[in-house]
């Protein structure tokens, strides 16, 4: 006759291990099931009753591993204004950032923006740097570039793109400032002279 | 009138430079950011480099970044493209172009184009 | 492969509408990026269409007109005329380059 297959959680015979995906729980003294990557026992097993699993919640990830599943959710590290996403977060790994490149810059705190380049600009009112986009002089106050950007009757910022720390000298008449608070994503930019 | 014209385009080997020029009239120089586009024989166009009216920020395309230096003389009327390291996928009709009054994303005057051949 | 997405042709007779999409992404026109369109005729130089989505340079006749919507937009040329014969590329500012990104084009052709 065929050994009878064990459900979890069941009482190992002496000398054998758990099978594949299962382990042994010291305070139950069963063979319990492990929880996938990237969830947690938000239940650990009994005498009567099997682990119960729960993946961490959206914007966290397993920071530590066991052989029941993950012990701990900890919240996705997020890049503060100048660093962007070098490498998503997973299920079991974290956020991991970089510093801008020159030419490219993030404004959010954030565990998904990435580095974006700065805006090209007729005449520059204001260097973009790793934090902030570059300001244009804006000779179209009407111009639609994109979602809330916002116009501003003087620059609001001296703060210097990598190497150029003044605005662009100009002839043309200069109405106003377009400041851009748009969508925060992707990366790879401009230089500066 | 508005005018670009380029020139200094050529044959060049694989590895070698190359020089463009582009010289605009009509229009006041210094208030626009300027453009190259390229287009491959029989194909689309790519935008390659941007510099803004004040020569103080230049823009790239990651295909040519760090082989291409984009520049300009605003007392000349003139724009550049160093071009080095040429490659046999560098081959393009190069054109300049006007960024567009209010908005630098689009090109509301461009040049008649020089060629660019890169062979061994 | 192209960032914009274009028919890589279209075509009608004289007379006729034709209309020619342009498709982006959510880090393009559905940013909330204008979508710019040019014109190249055979031998010749690119040549401003459309800009910011529905606005004709001074020149341009009214049959050519632009729309946009959501992640796509679209250029429509009534009255079709032999002279439209020529390539068409939309473009338009992207999130995550440094420069405006172009269609692959589309070939109008202008039958009979």
């Known amino acids: 006759l065929p050994a009878q297959v064990a459900f979890t959680p069941y009482a190992p015979e002496p000398g054998s291990t758990c099978r594949l995906r299962e382990y042994y729980d010291q305070t139950a003294q069963m063979c319990c099931s492990k929880c996938s990557p990237g969830q947690h026992a938000k239940v650990f097993c009994t005498k009567t009753s099997d682990t119960v699993c729960d993946t961490c919640r959206p914007g966290w990830y397993c920071a530590l591993s066991k052989q029941e599943g993950c012990r701990l959710c900890a919240p996705l590290r997020k890049c503060r204004p100048g660093f962007g996403v070098a490498r998503p977060g997973t299920e079991t790994s974290d956020v991991v950032c970089k510093p801008c490149a020159p030419g490219t810059f993030s404004n959010t705190t954030s565990s998904t923006d990435i580095c974006r380049p700065h805006q090209i600009c007729n005449v520059v009112a204001i260097p973009g740097n790793a934090s902030m986009d570059a300001v244009c002089t804006s000779t179209s106050p009407t111009r639609s570039m994109a979602p809330g950007a916002v116009h501003l009757p003087q620059p609001v910022s001296t703060r210097s793109q990598h190497t150029q720390p003044t605005p662009e000298p100009s002839t043309a008449p200069s109405t106003s400032f377009l400041l851009p608070m748009g969508p925060s994503p992707p990366a790879e930019g401009s230089t500066g002279d | 009138e508005v005018q670009l014209l380029e020139s200094g385009g050529g044959l060049v080997q694989p590895g070698g430079s190359l020089r463009l020029s582009c010289a605009a009239s009509?229009?006041?120089?210094?208030?626009?950011?300027m453009h190259w586009v390229r287009q491959a024989p029989g194909k689309g166009l790519e935008w390659v480099s941007a510099?803004?009216?004040?020569?103080?920020?230049?823009y790239y395309a990651d295909s040519v970044k760090g082989r291409f230096t984009i520049s300009r003389d605003n007392s000349k009327n003139t724009l550049y493209l160093q071009m080095n390291s040429l490659r046999a996928e560098d081959t393009a009709v190069y054109y300049c172009?006007?960024?567009?009054?209010?908005?630098?994303?689009?090109?509301?005057?461009w040049g008649q184009g020089t060629l660019v051949t890169v062979s061994s | 492969q192209s960032v914009l997405t274009q028919p890589p042709s279209a075509s009608g007779t004289p007379g006729q509408r034709v209309t020619i999409s342009c498709t982006g992404s959510?880090?393009?026109?559905?940013?909330?990026?204008?979508v710019h369109w040019y014109q190249q005729l055979p031998g010749t130089a690119p040549k401003l269409l459309i800009y910011?989505?529905?606005q004709r340079p001074s020149g341009v006749p009214d049959r050519f007109s632009g729309s946009k919507s959501g992640t796509s937009a679209s250029l429509a040329i009534s009255g079709l005329r032999s002279e439209d014969e020529a390539d068409y590329y939309c473009?338009?500012?992207?999130?995550?380059?440094?420069?405006?990104?172009f269609g692959g084009g589309t070939k109008l052709t202008v039958l009979g």
């Open positions: 172009a006007k960024g567009g009054t209010g908005d630098p994303y689009y090109f509301d005057y």
């Open positions: 009509g229009f006041t120089f210094s208030s626009y950011a």
């Open positions: 510099i803004s009216g004040g020569a103080t920020t230049t």
């Open positions: 959510s880090s393009n026109i559905g940013a909330g990026y204008d």
């Open positions: 910011r989505n529905n």
């Open positions: 473009a338009a500012r992207d999130d995550g380059l440094s420069g405006p990104v």
